[in-house]
Each structure stands twice: as C-alpha cells, then as structure tokens.
C-alpha cells in the first residue's frame, strides 16, 4: 500500500483530471507576491491534495501552497520573477501532474477601484474616472483597463471601450437621454508582463438628463 | 535542436566599447531567460548579466555594472551586450546562454574579445 | 554574497571513481539548485547535472549530483571513468538575480 490515497487507490486517483490554472499578483501586499492556484474541475476530491511550486524561488527550492476552502494559495517575497517554476497537484511526495509557469506570464491585476461619473454640463459630456494600485507599483504599472457600460435595462447590452489612463470622457449624444446607466472597469497587463483581466471594479450607476425640449439638449441630473 | 551563436567580438582598446550579438533558434527565445558569461584566458567562467524574457528584468555582476548593457530583440531572436568602458581585464571569451525550463542551461560557441592597445 | 569553492584539480584512472566538491562559504546549500557544467578543452559548458541530482538527457548515468547539507556542500560524482571524461567542471547557484559559479575543477584521467 502506497499510504498517499485514501478513498480509493493512488492508480484510481490518477485516472482523475487534475488540471488546474493559476494566477499571480505582484506587489499585492507592500513588497509581498501571491500565487493563486485552483483545480478546472469544481468536483475534484482536494482532501488529500496539495500543490507545491519548485523553481525560481529566492533562497528556498520550494514552497507549498495554503489551502484556503477550494483554492490553493501562497503569499511571500520569494518569488524571483525569473525563469520558470515548477508547480505540481501533489499526494504525499508524489506529483500527479505539473506545470512549468513563469510567474510574470500568469498576472491578474488588482481590481481598479474609486469609479465615478461627473456630468459636464458646459460640455455636454459625462467624465469617467476611476484609480488602479498599479500606478505605485515597481512591476506591473502599465496596464490596459477595459470599461464596460450598458443601459440598467438592456441586461448583456455592454459597450467597452479599451484605454490606458484612468480617465475617460463620453459624449452626452451617444447615451440615450433620462436613462440610468451601469458602468464598470477592470485591467489587465498591457507591457512585459502577461496574464488576466482583473476582477471587475464594483459597478457605478449614474443617470443621463432628460432632453431638453427647447434646445435639444439633455436636463442635467 | 537549440543552437545559439554569438558574433561582435575583435580587438578594442582600452576605453573603447563594443557590442555583441548572440542570434537564437531552435527554441522560443521570447520564452527564454537569457545569460552573458564570460571566461577569461585559462582561467574560470564568470557570470555577467541576465535579461528576462520580455527585457523587463535586467541584471549584472558588480564587476560590469554601469559599464555594459543586456538587452534583446525578441522579433529578431537576437541578444545583445553592450560593453562601454572596456578594461584590459574585460578580454575573455563571451558566452551567451539560455536558461532552459528550470533545468540546464544551453551556451553558444563564445566570441572572443581583446581589450589592448 | 557567498562563494563557492571547489578543488582546483583531481584525477582518478580508467574504471574508477571521482567525486568533486563544491562548498558554500555563506548561507545554506540548500537554498537554491546546484547545477554542474562540463567544458572540454576548446569548447563551451555543457549541463551534466541541474537541481541537484537530475540528469539531462543524453548525459551516462556515471554522472550523479547530490546535496550534503552538514558540510554545506555540492557533490559531482563520476563512475566508469573514461578518458573522455577529462575535462574542467563548473558547479553553479543562483544568488538572488545573480549566478555564482564555483572556480572549476581541472578532471585528469589518468
């Protein structure tokens, strides 16, 4: 008896898909890196799993993740962002599967945050703005957000638009008059390194001014 | 097969600078961690430079920093060293190496540099 | 900064068996992988042994590395020698963003 599976033997734990994507956040906590590891699969058996990232480290060789509810986890400085890690679903000292994963390849940003909307009613536009941890960071500073807005009743009716800064203004004409409107802004690497959209920032909600029937323009709100 | 090729080396006097190329197939470069080592005439090797794979991440032995300069072209497949500054101490034969995948490393066939007047 | 340091040559005849050190002045061996290089006369390094103990392939299994952390040190052992065998090896760690590479040992067989 091999002592590593329970609930069946090593062999029958090996015919399961132990396929599993994760992601990196650098700087998340002042000089403090994460790596956020979790199973494809939501009905995997984790209870004797552990994942484990080999390589690439600052003086150690390896680490072993936190399990935290179904996703694996670790927090420390001694990532060294060069090269490859190994990161493997291990049971006791056997790897059932492995990935050779440059950290800086597999970043998600932090969900910007602060987002607001201010009517201008000299210009008869509406000013987006909205800030991003990223701008003080060492690494990941050069982002690309994707902000996302829709009409409150049109459900998956979004119109994105892609932008470097943090601030973007949208024409009163393009948005339809007296309407409440949904906006939000996630980020995603956009130089040297690689990866993911960050979560959505929480959304803001702002409401467009009636027409004004006089000069065809819109009532401010 | 990786095959790595470094060219840029000759004679230059002291003070004078040079650059080397180190052109990459056979693997994906823009994947690859990149190396300078040099090895001085009979005598052991000595690292000088690293570049991550998309150039964010430089650094240098003490012995060469603020004097020469990593960098890559990762459309060409070329790495480069600039060397600025140059010391009779520089002369050697230069290296490039890839970092495999957390495993050995793979060098090219050198360059040699003379630093004399 | 730490150095590593390995004995400048060592011989052994045909059929036998070497081993090299490489000792670390500073720090724990066990901090990051040790890599060994062979470099014959005229050419350039070669991996025979990366993390420790692993083998690329193409490389006899004559070769072995192994970690002995009471001694702070790195060990490249060659079995069966073979008068190819004779050549200078480099082992090798990370310090941080640096490489540190031990000062070579000049292998004669004899």
């Known amino acids: 008896e091999s002592g590593y599976a329970q609930n069946g033997d090593l062999e029958d734990a090996e015919l399961d898909d132990y396929s599993f994507s994760c992601y990196s956040q650098l700087e998340v906590n002042g000089s403090q890196h994460s790596l956020t590891c979790a199973f494809e699969d939501p009905d995997v058996n984790i209870t004797n799993l552990e994942f484990e990232i080999c390589g690439a480290l600052v003086e150690v060789k390896c680490l072993n993740f936190r399990k935290l509810q179904e996703i694996y986890f670790i927090e420390t400085k001694k990532f060294l962002l060069i090269g490859k890690s190994n990161i493997c679903v291990k049971v006791g000292e056997k790897s059932l599967t492995c990935k050779k994963i440059d950290l800086t390849t597999i970043v998600k940003p932090e969900a910007p945050f602060d987002l607001s909307v201010v009517y201008r009613e000299g210009a008869n536009d509406f000013v987006v703005t909205f800030n991003t941890s990223h701008l003080q960071k060492k690494y990941v500073k050069v982002l690309m957000h994707d902000v996302a807005y829709r009409q409150e009743k049109d459900e998956n009716k979004w119109t994105h638009v892609n932008l470097s800064s943090t601030k973007l203004t949208l024409l009163q004409r393009k948005l339809q008059p007296a309407a409440m409107y949904e906006i939000k802004v996630r980020s995603i690497p956009d130089h040297y390194f690689k990866g993911f959209w960050s979560e959505w920032s929480p959304s803001y909600y702002f409401r467009t001014p009636e027409i004004n029937n006089s000069s065809g323009e819109m009532d401010p709100i | 097969q990786v095959n790595l090729r470094e060219s840029g080396g000759g004679l230059v006097k002291p003070g004078g600078s040079l650059r080397l190329s180190c052109a990459a197939s056979?693997?994906?470069?823009?994947?690859?961690?990149m190396h300078w080592v040099r090895q001085a005439p009979g005598k052991g090797l000595e690292w000088l430079s690293l570049?991550?794979?998309?150039?964010?991440?430089?650094y240098y032995a003490d012995s060469v920093k603020g004097r020469f300069t990593i960098s890559r072209d990762n459309t060409k497949n070329l790495l480069y060293l600039q060397m600025n500054s140059l010391r009779a101490e520089d002369t050697a034969v230069y290296y490039c190496?890839?970092?495999?995948?957390?495993?050995?490393?793979?060098w090219g066939q050198g360059t040699l540099v003379t630093v004399s007047s | 900064n730490f150095m590593l340091t390995q004995p400048h040559s060592v011989s052994g005849s045909p059929g036998k068996t070497v081993t090299i050190s490489c000792t670390r002045s500073?720090?724990?061996?066990?901090?990051?992988?040790v890599q060994w290089y062979q470099q014959r006369p005229g050419n350039s390094p070669t991996t025979v042994i990366y993390?420790?103990?692993?083998?690329p392939s193409g490389v006899p299994d004559r070769f072995s590395g192994s970690i002995d952390s009471s001694s702070n040190s790195a060990s490249l052992t060659i079995s069966g020698l073979v008068t190819e065998d004779e050549a200078d090896y480099y082992c090798?760690?990370?310090?941080?963003?640096?490489?540190?590479f031990g000062g070579g040992t000049k292998l004669t067989v004899l």
């Open positions: 190496a890839r970092q495999g995948d957390y495993m050995g490393n793979n």
């Open positions: 056979g693997f994906t470069f823009d994947d690859s961690v």
């Open positions: 570049v991550g794979w998309d150039g964010f991440f430089t």
């Open positions: 500073s720090g724990s061996i066990d901090s990051s992988y």
């Open positions: 993390e420790d103990d692993q083998r």
């Open positions: 090798m760690q990370y310090d941080f963003h640096h490489l540190v």
